[in-house]
């Protein structure tokens, strides 16, 4: 499932090339392993900002598909309470390109530990 998430992220990256979306998104660029679930939930919410601002059906569908895959993959450890992690609002705001790169990194963390 996480591998499919990465391919959806690549697809989103390709789709936004032709668009002008200047949104900045809360991005965890240095995820601590003990906060990866919290960080993933922030990434998943921020991803929907891209969908909200683009108005593009392909982006909307790909974002939704990614969220389905990621939530299902998270469900086994999504209820784990991670303490001492940053709230989404405390993260740095980055442009979409940097956001998607960091997203790929955190997904790889999940792949490596599954």
């Amino acid at each position: 499932n996480w591998v499919n998430v990465i391919s959806d992220l690549k697809k989103i990256e390709d789709l936004i090339q032709s668009m002008h979306i200047d949104a900045t998104l809360y991005t965890e660029s240095d995820v601590h392993p003990s906060c990866k679930v919290t960080a993933m939930k922030c990434f998943l919410l921020e991803l929907q900002v891209i969908s909200l601002e683009s108005g593009d059906a392909s982006i909307h569908d790909t974002v939704e598909n990614l969220i389905i895959l990621a939530n299902n993959s998270l469900s086994s450890n999504g209820n784990v309470t991670e303490s001492g992690c940053k709230e989404c609002e405390e993260l740095e705001e980055k442009n979409i390109k940097e956001f998607l790169q960091s997203f790929v990194h955190i997904v790889q963390m999940f792949i490596n530990t599954s």
Partner: antibody, heavy 125, light 111 residues
Framework: QVQLVQSGAEVKKPGASVKVSCKAS????????ISWVRQAPGQGLEWLGW????????KYAQKFQDRVTMTTDTSTSTAYMELRSLRSDDTAVYYC??????????????????WGQGTMVTVSS | QSVLTQPPSASGTPGQRVTISCSGS????????VYWYQQLPGTAPKLLIY???RRPSGVPDRFSGSKSGTSASLAISGLRSEDEADYYC???????????FGGGTKLTVLG
């Protein structure tokens, strides 16, 4: 397109309960949340609470904590809001709205879009 | 209980620029985003502005949001008759973990 269709108007007696439904289409219902908001005649908007259709987590406004129950049925992509011990001041239009939060920690950065058409609930003896 | 204060009414003529304010206490608006919803007569509310100033796709750029200190504003430029509606600000109270709405502002387009 994303659409939320709510059940029809209800007339209830004080002390009774009402259950309003909200049927979603055009998106993966079980991956997101639903918030419920009400509007008394000629008044402003008031948030009642949120439910995640993904995991069933709920967060209710303090004011309604002991009288409201929100549920979802993912097999029919429908959310429900039940309000008990109705009083005349519960007379209002009740709205459901799609909420991007599937997890509680996402709630503080969420938004409500789109909204259902509303369900008028009248409480009168 | 946290409160967001909006003027009950505002008005303008077609083509004009109108601003609607939303004020909160010192502690709240500064560290929380403000959202704006438009409710046309007899219809459900619609998301107009989110996270202080961002516009969802499909919302005309005549609508803009801003925030300064403890007050947020919605500006509508090039006012049109179809902008006649109720406008609500909202924010998330992190202490209570609840959404709070302002009392709403009824915008009338004159003439």
């Amino acid at each position: 397109q994303v659409q939320l269709v709510q059940s029809g108007a209800e007339v209830k007696k004080p002390g009774a309960s009402v259950k309003v439904s909200c049927k979603a289409s055009g998106y993966s219902f079980s991956s997101f949340g639903i918030s419920w908001v009400r509007q008394a005649p000629g008044q402003g908007l008031e948030w009642l609470g949120w439910i995640s259709a993904f995991n069933g987590y709920t967060k209710y406004a303090q004011k309604f904590q002991d009288r409201v129950t929100m549920t979802t049925d993912t097999s029919t992509s429908t959310a429900y809001m039940e309000l008990r011990s109705l009083r005349s001041d519960d007379t209002a239009v009740y709205y459901c709205a799609r909420d991007p939060a599937a997890w509680p920690l996402q709630q503080s950065l969420a938004w409500f879009d789109p909204w259902g058409q509303g369900t008028m609930v009248t409480v009168s003896s | 209980q946290s409160v967001l204060t909006q003027p009950p009414s505002a008005s303008g003529t077609p083509g004009q620029r109108v601003t609607i304010s939303c004020s909160g206490s010192t502690s709240n608006l500064k560290r929380n985003y403000v959202y704006w919803y438009q409710q046309l007569p007899g219809t459900a509310p619609k998301l107009l502005i989110y996270r202080d100033r961002r516009r969802p796709s499909g919302v005309p750029d005549r609508f803009s949001g801003s925030k300064s200190g403890t007050s947020a504003s919605l500006a509508i430029s090039g006012l049109r008759s179809e902008d006649e509606a109720d406008y609500y600000c909202a924010w998330y109270d992190r202490e209570l973990s609840e959404w709070v709405f302002g009392g709403g502002t009824k915008l009338t387009v004159l003439g």
